[in-house]
């Protein structure tokens, strides 16, 4: 369960892929589209508001029933819109929603390296936000084989 309804911290950052392509958001026909693209040098990168939440992780291994804490994030590129996992379509979408946010808007934050992160679906462990055909998609990761897959690695820059 997520402890408390307020985030422990928030930050504004631009999101880019491991290969330095930018994640951008465009309003089209009253809905937002998400693109993965090379930005022209003079173009400003889109910023995303990352809100960080603590989540207790239950475990049978420790006596108190809690093995540790996870850090969950929500990502909002513009007011009232959040990235959400659509597990049925294996897609990542931007939806307008009110708080409390649905579980599909929460992602477990992984530091794969000090400057690379991955976003794992709260609602579908082992499934991560990734890049597929120049779009964001949900990608199932085999922990034993593809933990370092470049297509699920992202960089955050303030």
């Amino acid at each position: 369960s997520i402890t408390g309804i307020s985030p422990i911290t928030e930050s504004l950052a631009s999101l880019s892929t491991y290969n330095d392509q930018s994640i951008t958001f465009a309003l089209e026909d009253e809905s937002y589209e998400i693109y993965v693209e090379d930005l022209k040098k003079d173009k400003k990168k889109d910023k995303v508001l990352l809100s960080y939440y603590e989540s207790q992780h239950p475990s049978s291994e420790s006596g108190d029933g809690v093995d540790g804490k996870m850090l969950m994030v929500t990502l909002s590129p513009t007011k009232d819109f959040w990235l959400q996992a659509n597990n049925k379509e294996h897609s990542v979408e931007l939806h307008k929603c009110e708080k409390p946010l649905p579980d599909q808007a929460f992602f477990v934050l992984h530091n794969r390296s000090f400057n690379c992160v991955s976003f794992e679906c709260k609602t579908d462990p082992g499934v991560f936000i990734g890049v597929k055909d120049n779009h964001l998609a949900l990608i199932k990761v085999d922990y034993s084989e593809n933990l370092g897959s470049e297509n699920i690695l992202f960089k955050l820059s303030e």
Partner: antibody, heavy 122, light 107 residues
């Protein structure tokens, strides 16, 4: 209960090597970044090395880069620090620490071992 | 590297007194700032993380605040067991760096 127990410290001569171990228990070891931090006698704290929860990434300050190597054996829930070309300024108590969150570096170090003293002297 | 300048280096306080320790960073960063207490001959203990979040089991007289480059630790009502060294630490950028410490003694 989370426990971190360091071992392997001792008195060594300059230029020699030493390997420290840290046995972890009470938590799922392979879900956490692990870090070595040292403290010279009567001095402050110094970050020495970190390793990702996957073991795929390692990080060091310039003071030990190329001489020290951090590694982990998840099957044994053990963290290691291989220290080569030791210098007198490496004399310190070495602490094994665990990150605050699964998979993550954020939030400081809530768990520390008791420390193991390394003395480098001729 | 981010330098963490901690002040004062030492401090004497009477029992019940409110005490503040400050950490000044050489450059601004997100709030990945922790405070530790280290009693003589013991390992450090995490008091505060994320600049202001109290670690489980730590008395509520300890509090943290600040953002950007300026952070502080406050002890509201000094107790005998609070006599210790205190260190700040930033975790936003590698290399991870600590403040040089504040020795807090009872007057």
């Amino acid at each position: 209960e989370v426990q971190l127990v360091e071992s392997g410290g001792g008195l060594v001569q300059p230029g020699t090597s030493l390997k420290l171990s840290c046995l972890a228990s009470g938590f799922t070891f392979n879900n956490y970044w692990m870090t070595w931090i040292r403290q010279a006698p009567g001095k402050g704290l110094e970050w020495i090395a970190s390793i990702t929860y996957t073991g795929g990434g390692t990080y060091y300050p310039d003071s030990v880069k190329g001489r020290f190597t951090i590694s982990r054996d998840d099957a044994k829930s053990t963290l290691y620090l291989q220290m080569n070309s030791l210098r007198s300024e490496d004399t310190a108590t070495y602490y094994c620490t665990r990150a605050n969150y699964y998979y993550n570096t954020y939030g400081g170090f809530p768990y520390w071992g008791q420390g193991t003293l390394v003395t480098v002297s001729s | 590297d981010i330098q963490m300048t901690q002040s004062p280096a030492s401090l004497s306080a009477s029992l019940g007194e409110t005490v503040s320790i400050e950490c000044l960073a050489s450059e601004g960063f997100s709030n990945d700032l922790a405070w530790y207490q280290q009693k003589s001959g013991k390992s450090p203990q995490l008091l505060i993380y994320a600049a202001s979040r109290l670690q489980d089991g730590v008395p509520s007289r300890f509090s943290g605040s600040g953002s950007g480059t300026r952070f502080s630790l406050k002890i509201s009502g000094m107790q005998p067991e609070d006599e210790a060294d205190y260190f700040c630490q930033q975790g936003s950028k590698y290399p991870l760096t600590f403040g040089s410490g504040t020795k807090l003694e009872i007057k």
